[in-house]
Interface confidence: medium
Amino acid sequence: TSISPGRCKWNKHTLTYRIINYPHDMKPSAVKDSIYNAVSIWSNVTPLIFQQVQNGDADIKVSFWQWAHEDGWPFDGPGGILGHAFLPNSGNPGVVHFDKNEHWSASDTGYNLFLVATHEIGHSLGLQHSGNQSSIMYPTYWYHDPRTFQLSADDIQRIQHLYGEKCSSDIP
């Protein structure tokens, strides 16, 4: 889910990201791998570069919360809303929240964190939902094997519309 009006993009190439806390049922190393793979999906097709930081502020802040968590967009327990992210032009740019009450995994059990993170980070980069079912920005969760996952042409076109191609420099 994307939150707040916003048509902006990030006006820089290099974005930092930080994983602030972790879910109950996934090893921190697996969470780190999932988030790393998710940001890499987007950097592979744009000029964007993502750098993980361990402390302090970051452009993209990933965290796990449950129920109401003081951003006005409460989670709803297992199932339902899996996560939400704020668009770059919102009051909370780069904030990515996942529902702590989901069963997160790096496989096909529960909800695959890599897939949901790729979707939410898409929002945090400025992408809206897509009605194209093959798009990672489709609003309903669909499982794909993360090892063979690829962005759809629709995803690539829209993210490059914002940031340009990998070898281009369409950011001012």
Partner: antibody
């Protein structure tokens, strides 16, 4: 104040070529998507082409693909549309329009330049 | 498809409300929230009045509102005024790096 001023329109024979220009001022040209949109006499609007801020990405309507080329010179704050192999159905007022940051809608438009393709 | 479907004309008396529809497909209007509306007075350039389905640029009166349901977008002009008489065009991103306009609706204030 944002201003867009198109030029280069005129009468051309079928099969001929024309280059339209759009001089931009009042904003940082190099930061915005730009579009060309046309309107045949008495008809509706038709999107023609779009170009990314640095010129690295270009889009075209199927009706002009392979015949028209969009380009820009950010040092001159100018947008161009090179039109080749012109047809009677290309007759229209051509508007230059500034794209919003996502590029999918246009918030400022020029007053247009008329292109007439006729023998 | 080459064009979104709009009614060719609509009308209303001053002070009334008028709604203009814009019907596309699941590949354009239904697929994205990139729907915008333009107002064009005779002999003038189009003016953006709605973007991203229902957002108004600054300076556009709140008499103009819009929404989307499924493959159909709608523009409502409430409290009609004489200066609202114009042509109105909807526009949508249509995937594959293309944009598509509606055929236009001529709004007459009676």
């Amino acid at each position: 104040e944002v201003q867009l001023l198109e030029s280069g329109g005129g009468l051309v024979q079928p099969g001929g070529s024309l280059r339209l220009s759009c001089a931009a001022s009042g904003f940082t040209f190099s930061q915005y998507w730009m579009n060309w949109v046309r309107q045949a006499p008495g008809k509706g609007l038709e999107w023609v082409s779009g170009i990314g801020p640095s010129g690295g990405i270009t889009y075209y309507a199927d009706s002009v693909k392979g015949r028209f080329t969009i380009s820009r010179d950010n040092s001159k704050n100018t947008l161009y549309l090179q039109m080749n192999s012109l047809r009677a159905e290309d007759t229209a007022v051509y508007y230059c329009a500034r794209g919003e940051e996502d590029g999918y809608n246009s918030d400022y438009w020029g007053q247009g330049t008329l292109v007439t393709v006729s023998s | 498809q080459s064009e979104l479907t709009q009614p060719p004309s609509a009308s209303g008396s001053p002070g009334q409300s008028v709604t203009i529809s814009c019907t596309g497909t699941s590949s354009d209007v239904g697929a994205y929230n990139y729907v915008s509306w333009y107002q064009q007075h005779p002999g003038k350039a189009p003016k953006l009045i709605i973007y991203e389905v229902n957002k108004r640029p600054s300076g556009v009166p709140d008499r103009f509102s819009a929404s989307k349901s499924g493959n159909t977008a709608s523009l409502t002009v409430s409290g009609l005024q004489a200066e609202d008489e114009a042509d109105y065009y909807c526009n949508s991103y249509a995937g594959s790096n293309s944009l598509i306009f509606g055929g236009g609706t001529k709004l007459t204030v009676l």
